[in-house]
């Protein structure tokens, strides 16, 4: 049975969205993005104790392997399990373009 | 420009599949999967340097991120770019049956 | 091709709230920023704030700063500003912009009529 | 906060001849990555504003080929090399090197 969302490291420990703000020149952007010069970045943060948010059969075993042979097996995770665009205008060769983005901004998060 | 798939800290440390030899026992299937009774379980493991297998924009942004605030954000992390299928024999109420599994055995792996 | 809807005309009383709905039809707001701007009859436009992708938190200019708040939820496509402690002064037609960054206002929503009097 | 002025307030012109509009600003627009932050728009009678110029002179996809935009630093300028009657309206130039973004108090073009 699956704890979901339930953390059992206390609140806020385990696998969860994280917003972070950052500039252009902190993303390494700046030689090449115009637009927005700044960024709510959204990223996937936290640790994934067994049965957190597991994402898949594959998440199950790993966890279970990892508890076996921690040495070996690294525990599951936090990865974005889905994405939300953002579009930029860039530099291009010729001028600027604007370019939609559709894995940049991680939307929610899982244990893989 | 993107190093690929070479790997700076050395042969085999980067993120890569691996092969983890284990019993039903192991994965705590025991009691539910009657075949196979051994499985060679793929998964990804190994460390995510810069620009190494990058899946996507978020990893880029994640790694520039990490570099910047080590204590805040963690690295990419090592995951399955796709999966292998594999059929199970399984127990059911009324007997046994056999279930496609689309998402156990890791195919490929990339940094997230 | 993307048009934002705005909610419809509001006359509200001094001291009072106003909020202004702006729904992407024809889809999402496609990882666009979304701004605000103001304009007063016969005068000319004035940046109220903006929200960028993923919608979390909003920029206002310091003259707006304390009343107005602006929102999105993606889930329904729809954008938000909420003026408070209104005041003769803020009778206006309020219209929001999707852009990038603050800028590139290329999509406008048709305007709301906020008037206010008592 | 950054003022923009605009020059004339009013501009009457004649169909198939050329025409220009000047926009100044308190402080330089030209951002270090050697793009300047200012944008224009045209509000046609009864309708709201339209994306015609982005970045000091890059025109907005479906704008016609007649409006161009210029300048650098302080002082830019919006041509329409042939004007038609469909282009009146008051034009406006914005700002948006930082916040708050500040218009200026717009240009009405008529129809001699």
């Known amino acids: 049975a699956r704890n979901g969302d339930r953390c059992p490291l206390g609140p806020g420990r385990c696998c969860r969205l994280h917003t972070v703000h950052a500039s252009l020149e902190d993303l390494g952007w700046a030689d090449w993005v115009l637009s927005p010069r700044e960024v709510q970045v959204t990223m996937c943060i936290g640790a994934c104790p067994s049965q957190f948010r597991e994402a898949n059969m594959h998440a199950q075993i790993k966890m279970n392997l990892h508890r076996l042979k921690p040495d070996t097996v690294p525990a599951p995770c936090c990865v974005p399990a889905s994405y939300n665009p953002m579009v930029l205008i860039q530099k291009t060769d010729t001028g600027v373009s604007l370019q939609t983005y559709d894995d940049l901004l991680a939307k929610d998060c899982h244990c893989v | 420009a993107r190093n690929g798939d070479r790997c700076p800290l050395g042969p085999g440390r980067c993120c890569r599949l691996h092969t983890v030899h284990a019993s039903l026992e192991d994965l705590g299937w025991a009691d539910w999967v009657l075949s196979p009774r051994e499985v060679q379980v793929t998964m990804c493991i190994g460390a995510c340097p810069s620009q190494f297998r990058e899946a996507n924009m978020h990893a880029q942004i994640k790694m520039n991120l990490h570099r910047l605030k080590p204590d805040t954000v963690p690295a990419p992390c090592c995951v399955p770019a796709s999966y292998n299928p594999m059929v199970l024999i399984q127990k059911t109420d009324t007997g046994v049956s056999l279930q496609t599994y689309d998402d156990l055995l890791a195919k490929d792996c990339h940094c997230v | 091709q993307v048009q934002l809807v705005q909610s419809g005309a509001e006359v509200k009383k001094p001291g009072s709230s106003v909020k202004v709905s702006c729904k992407a039809s024809?889809?999402?707001?496609?990882?666009?920023?979304i701004s605000w701007a103001r304009q007063a009859p016969g005068q000319g436009l004035e940046w109220m704030g903006g929200?960028?992708?993923?919608?979390?938190?909003?920029n206002y200019a310091q003259k707006f700063q304390g009343r107005v708040t602006i929102t999105a939820d993606e889930s329904t496509s729809t954008a938000y500003m909420e003026l408070s402690s209104l005041r003769s002064e803020d009778t206006a037609v309020y219209y929001c912009?999707?852009?990038?960054?603050?800028?590139?206002?290329?999509?406008w929503g048709q305007g709301t009529m906020v008037t206010v009097s008592s | 906060d950054i003022v923009m002025t605009q020059s004339p307030l009013s501009l009457p012109v004649t169909p198939g001849e050329p025409a220009s509009i000047s926009c100044r600003s308190s402080q330089s627009l030209l951002h270090s990555n050697g793009y300047n932050y200012l944008d224009w728009y045209l509000q046609k009678p009864g309708q709201s504003p339209q994306l015609l110029i982005y970045?000091?002179?890059n025109r907005a996809s479906g704008v016609p080929d007649r409006f161009s935009g210029s300048g650098s630093g302080t002082d830019f300028t919006l041509k329409i090399s042939r004007v038609e009657a469909e282009d009146v309206g008051v034009y406006y130039c914005m700002q948006a090197l930082q916040t708050p973004i500040t218009f200026g108090g717009g240009t009405k073009v008529e129809i001699k």
């Open positions: 970045l000091g002179s």
């Open positions: 024809g889809g999402t707001f496609q990882g666009y920023a």
């Open positions: 912009a999707r852009g990038v960054g603050e800028l590139h206002l290329d999509v």
């Open positions: 929200i960028i992708p993923p919608y979390a938190t909003a």
